[in-house]
């Protein structure tokens, strides 16, 4: 167990041109507050996915009113640290989201209005017990400077807060086989209390005899890497060779969600859906009121005037969750055309178009026949994001601008000789053959294989092909 601590140093305009307008004005004074969301691992997760390591809200900052004509300075910040307690081992790698929120204090109907000013995100490696790490992140024209650290809560120590320490029983040294607990040299590492054989790298325990696994490991001793790719079900066949999750208790067995929360399994762990008034990984945090601003993404908080009465977040369209923290997946309706990739930015949908298409929904075919002319009597044919010209006889090329050699394909059969002609081609047939392409043999008695020769043409005459 331990605490992740975040200290915001400044929030203001970033360097370079295009300074942002002050978020507050004389007519509409406001104050800032911050929200931090932590997730284990280095996965590039969506902003709406659960804050599995925890989340925290800061206090409100001082009220700020813009001075007319003055550039937007660094804005006044809330006092104190943002603290996110974690109950289990510190994962060592984590993803964070830090949101800067504005609370407008004008004459709002139904109380103050909240809006998201900036959101920064990142992925970091961090050992518990280390020094403060400093960071600068930019969101649009805004810049956020902050520091963070993870520290273990006694009796836990170590880079993952999984080793336990106890006060020394003897004044001078620790017991046999037990090391001093750096940096608490006056304490000793507690005797090993985990289940026998529990992996020291991938397992930990908080109670004697248990073996709890770090993310990515499973099995009674946390020695089996999780890989569900070849499994038949989320807890598929038990096999040391496949590396599938071992059958047994699922993450929701025994319902880890407190305060009436309901548990649902996720590919990596579990997720608690908390009743109103509770939040946190296991719905363990309570006592939230509307004054704490629990509703995100512009949600309207109703009720919850005191910690004993539950609040309700009325979410704006497109957001959901008991705190309006999750976005509805609008891209599942596939609004982008022609194979475009859908991106839900919250305030709008965007489509990333395939080559050959453009427009807000990739609805414009850049290579279609609109405005395309095929020369020399050719006709345009559309298809598959490209266009081609079907050229009139005697012409070729992409736009039918090139004069074609009608004899290039050797169209005259049986040794006939081809002559280009203004209206196409003419075949001079070898003796014994006739037809536009010299394709018909002439029978010895003078009759041809044709029912009848066209009037005015004798076998052996050059045939003009129109």
């Amino acid at each position: 167990a331990g605490v992740f601590e975040l200290q915001i140093h400044s929030f203001g305009p970033g360097p370079g041109p295009g300074a942002p307008r002050s978020p507050c004005s004389a007519r509409l004074p406001c104050r800032l507050f911050f929200r931090v969301c932590l997730k284990p691992g280095l996965s590039e997760e969506a902003a709406e996915s659960p804050c599995a390591l925890g989340a925290a809200l800061s206090a409100r900052g001082p009220v700020y009113t813009e001075q007319p004509g003055a550039p937007a300075p660094d804005l006044p910040l809330p006092d104190g640290l943002l603290q996110v307690p974690f109950r289990d081992a510190w994962p060592g790698t984590f993803s964070f989201i830090i949101e800067t929120w504005r609370e407008e204090l004008g004459d709002q109907i139904g109380g103050p209005a909240w809006s998201l000013l900036a959101r920064v995100a990142g992925r970091r490696r961090l050992a518990a017990g280390g020094p403060w790490a400093r960071d600068i992140q930019r969101a649009g024209a805004w810049e956020l400077r902050f520091s963070y650290r993870a520290r273990c809560e006694p009796p836990a120590v170590g880079t993952a807060c999984t080793r336990l320490c106890r006060p020394r029983s003897a004044p001078s040294r620790c017991g046999p086989g037990l090391r001093p607990c750096a940096p608490l040299e006056d304490e000793c590492e507690a005797p090993l209390v985990c289940r026998a054989g529990c992996s020291p790298e991938h397992g930990f325990c908080e109670q004697p005899g248990e073996c709890r696994c770090l993310e990515g490991w499973t099995g009674p001793l946390c020695t089996v890497p999780v890989s569900t790719s070849s499994c038949l079900s989320p807890r598929g066949p038990s096999s040391a060779t496949t590396g599938c999750l071992v059958p047994g208790p699922g993450p929701c067995d025994g319902n880890p969600c407190a305060n009436g929360g309901s548990c649902s399994e996720t590919p990596r762990s579990f997720e608690c859906t908390c009743p109103r008034g509770f939040y946190g990984l296991r719905c363990e945090v309570s006592g939230v009121t509307c004054a704490d601003g629990p509703c995100f993404n512009g949600g309207l908080c109703v009720g919850g005037a005191d910690p004993d009465s539950a609040y309700i977040c009325h979410c704006p369209p497109g957001f959901q969750g008991s705190n309006c923290e999750k976005r509805v997946d609008r891209c599942s309706l596939q609004p982008c055309r022609n194979g475009g990739l859908c991106l839900d930015l919250g305030h709008a949908l965007r489509c990333r178009c395939r080559a050959g298409f453009a427009g807000p929904r990739c609805e414009h075919d850049l290579d279609d026949c609109a405005g395309r002319a095929c020369a020399n009597g050719g006709t345009c044919v559309e298809g598959g994001g490209a266009h081609r010209c079907s050229c009139a006889l005697g012409f070729g090329g992409r736009d039918c601008r090139e004069r074609a050699d009608p004899c290039a394909a050797r169209p005259c059969a049986h040794g006939g000789r081809c002559y280009a002609h203004f209206s196409g081609l003419v075949c001079a047939c070898a003796p014994g053959y006739m037809g536009a392409r010299c394709e018909f043999p002439v029978h010895p008695d003078g009759a041809s294989a044709l029912p009848a020769a066209p009037p005015g043409l004798r076998p052996g005459d050059p045939q003009r092909y129109l």
Partner: nanobody, 119 residues
Framework: EVQLVESGGGEVQPGGSLRLSCAAS????????IGWYRQAPGKQRDMVAG???????TYAESVKGRFTISRDNAKNTVYLQMSSLRAEDTAVYYC?????????????WGQGTLVTVKP
């Protein structure tokens, strides 16, 4: 501004059928994509069925073979025929549409209609 108005919800027994309607109204708009989402108590709002931007029908795995989406372009109305209903289909069903107004696209939600499946 485009309004989406759902109707046809109600209570039905397992195995029964319902037909939901969603009528779009407004001025000078064209529908790019339109469909149905549903949200059960305490759950996420998920897409059930829809007509994509390419006017192809798409369905959630859990309703394939049981639900059918159709539309009447002349009436700017989309329908969801639900059959072989199960208890887990109980939810508020929302109509959603990606709509072109002028040169811009906007997303609209209806108010929702409740479908309850219970013996």
């Amino acid at each position: 501004e485009v309004q989406l108005v759902e109707s046809g919800g109600g209570e039905v027994q397992p195995g029964g059928s319902l037909r939901l309607s969603c009528a779009a109204s407004g001025s000078d708009f064209s529908i790019n994509a339109i469909g149905w989402y549903r949200q059960a108590p305490g759950k996420q709002r998920d897409m059930v069925a829809g007509f994509t931007g390419d006017t192809v029908t798409t369905y959630a795995e859990s309703v394939k073979g049981r639900f059918t989406i159709s539309r009447d372009n002349a009436k700017n109305t989309v329908y969801l025929q639900m059959s072989s209903l199960r208890a887990e289909d109980t939810a508020v069903y929302y109509c959603a549409a990606d709509v072109k107004i002028g040169g811009d696209y906007e997303w609209f939600w209806g108010q929702g209609t409740l479908v309850t499946v219970k013996p």
